[in-house]
Interface confidence: low
């Protein structure tokens, strides 16, 4: 190698200056007794190199690029060799921004997978490889007193969420949780959440069912539907409240909400609907009276209300 580049920093803030030095060893001087060192950023020649012969006979050129406005570029030093440039050395330069503070950190406790799933917004593009780490610790108080730390959770590349498995959680005990973003230009940390994983439990929705008609049961009245559901129960008992929504399948009607509903309903009659109309129904539940998150809406159940009975039959019902 005849030449060697060293730079003030290979990674800088976008728009910041960068200084580079290219040294040509003395044993390469046969190329030219006073070789003129040229600089190139990408494909463009860069003026402004200051060249000097050092006491040991080596040649040095120093250049300052006042603003590195490329997020990635190769800086090379070269000599004129005949009619072409002879590259002596090159370095990759990167420019970008330190990570912004991650924001909107929120967490859900998924009792199906027994894991605490946290997500956040990473902030604007840094143009540099930026790693995110979900950090947490156990606490018996309001997270001002710290207990054992929990192993860092590192999301897969490009993801802004991470799952802390059950084995690292103590349910019914507070945890301090925050996200740390890091790249070559700095580190930032989100505001800390303090939460009991069970207080952010997200339940699975119940399963809605149509009631099997039985010979002894009265048929539903006109404009009514008969249905049933069972609450989802994980391994531990969780009190919950539920709500139902429904809308006609046809037309532009919006959802109508009914609730709170009884926790379990082996038989529930929903009335006040349009007769002879197909309806879509869904149900969801939340831990209650303790804190939690609403479950997703259940898969839809599609049912049709009975037709309005003829007037004399209707009259007959009331006698």
């Amino acid at each position: 190698e005849c030449g060697h580049i060293s730079v003030s920093a290979p990674i800088v803030h976008l728009g910041d200056p960068i200084t580079a030095s290219c040294i040509i060893k003395q044993n390469c001087s046969h190329l030219d007794p006073e070789p003129q060192i040229l600089w190139r950023l990408g494909a463009e020649l860069q003026p402004g190199g200051r060249q000097q012969r050092l006491s040991d006979g080596t040649q040095e050129s120093i250049i300052t690029l006042p603003h590195l406005n490329h997020t990635q570029a190769f800086l090379s030093c070269a000599l004129n060799w005949g009619n072409s440039l002879q590259i002596l050395d090159q370095v990759e330069l990167r420019a970008g921004y330190p990570p912004a503070i991650p924001h909107n950190l929120s967490c859900l406790m998924n009792l199906t997978t027994s894991s605490l799933i946290c997500q956040w917004e990473p902030g604007p593009e840094t143009h540099l490889p930026t790693s995110f780490t979900l950090k947490s610790f156990k606490s018996r108080g309001n997270c001002q007193t710290q207990g054992d730390s929990i192993l860092d959770c590192v999301p897969k590349d490009g993801q802004s969420h991470c799952s802390i498995p059950r084995k690292h959680l103590l349910l019914y005990q507070n945890m301090g949780i925050w996200v740390q973003a890091e790249n070559a230009l700095g580190t930032s940390m989100s505001p800390q959440l303090c939460l009991d994983p069970m207080d952010v439990v997200k339940l699975e929705p119940p399963m809605l069912r149509t009631m099997d008609p039985s010979p002894e049961a009265a048929p539903p009245q006109a404009g009514c539907l008969q249905l049933s559901w069972e609450p989802w129960q994980p391994g531990l008992h969780i009190n919950q409240k539920c709500e139902l929504r429904h809308k006609p399948q046809r037309g532009e009607a919006s959802w109508a909400l009914v609730g709170p509903l009884p926790l379990e309903a082996l038989q529930y009659e929903l009335c006040g609907l349009l007769p002879a109309t197909a309806y879509t129904l869904q149900i969801r539940c939340i831990r209650w009276p303790l804190p939690g998150h609403w479950s997703d809406w259940s898969p839809s159940l599609e049912l049709r209300t009975t037709e309005r009975a003829p007037t004399h039959h209707h009259h007959h019902h009331h006698h």
Epitope: K135, S136, F137, D148, S149, G176, E182, T187, P191, Q192
Partner: antibody, heavy 118, light 107 residues
């Protein structure tokens, strides 16, 4: 009770090497960041280096970069600082410390004196 | 790296005095600021973490405040055992630099 015990300090000539050790007990060592902080005689505290729980992240102060290496052995609950190319200005008491989850130096050892002199 | 500047570098006070020490960061560090006490010949001791949180076992006469770049350690009523040197330290970045220290001496 958290305990941190440094060893390996002593007198060394400029250009020489030394390896400091810190034996930790009283907490789950493998879950915590650890660090080294030094204090030259009559001077203030100077952060030297720290290391993540797994050992994958190892930042250094500019003054020691390229000369010092921090490492840990989680199976032995021990933190190390390998110091090469020592200079007179590296003379200091070197403290081993356990970091809390917000980067605070929660617990400190009593320190070990490193003297670099010819 | 973020640099930490403490002031004053030393102060003289009497038992019972209210003492305030300030620490300034060269750029915003949110609340990631910690305070330590060190007595001669002893290892430092954590007093306050995350700007205002009292470490277990630290007397309540010590308090911390501030956010961003400017932080304060206050000793509400100085006790004989509080004569020591106090340091701030930022933990916003991995390069966790300390302030230069404030020596609290007996007047």
């Amino acid at each position: 009770e958290v305990q941190l015990l440094e060893s390996g300090g002593g007198l060394v000539q400029p250009g020489g090497s030394l390896r400091l050790s810190c034996a930790a007990s009283g907490f789950t060592f493998s879950l915590y960041w650890m660090g080294w902080v030094r204090q030259a005689p009559g001077k203030g505290l100077e952060w030297v280096s720290s290391i993540s729980s797994s050992g994958g992240v190892t930042p250094y102060a500019d003054s020691v970069k390229g000369r010092f290496t921090i490492s840990r052995d989680n199976s032995k609950n021990t933190l190390y600082l390998q110091m090469n190319s020592l200079r007179a200005e590296d003379t200091a008491v070197y403290y081993c410390a356990k970091l809390g989850e917000l980067g605070q130096y929660q617990f400190w050892g009593q320190g070990t004196l490193v003297t670099v002199s010819s | 790296d973020i640099q930490m500047t403490q002031s004053p570098s030393s102060l003289s006070a009497s038992v019972g005095d209210r003492v305030t020490i300030t620490c300034r960061a060269s750029q915003g560090i949110s609340s990631y600021l910690n305070w330590y006490q060190q007595k001669p010949g002893k290892a430092p001791k954590l007093l306050i973490y995350y700007a205002s949180n009292l470490q277990n076992g630290v007397p309540s006469r010590f308090s911390g405040s501030g956010s961003g770049t400017d932080f304060t350690l206050t000793i509400s009523s100085l006790q004989p055992e509080d004569f020591a040197t106090y340091y701030c330290q930022q933990s916003f970045q991995y390069a966790q630099h300390f302030g230069g220290g404030t020596k609290v001496e007996i007047k």
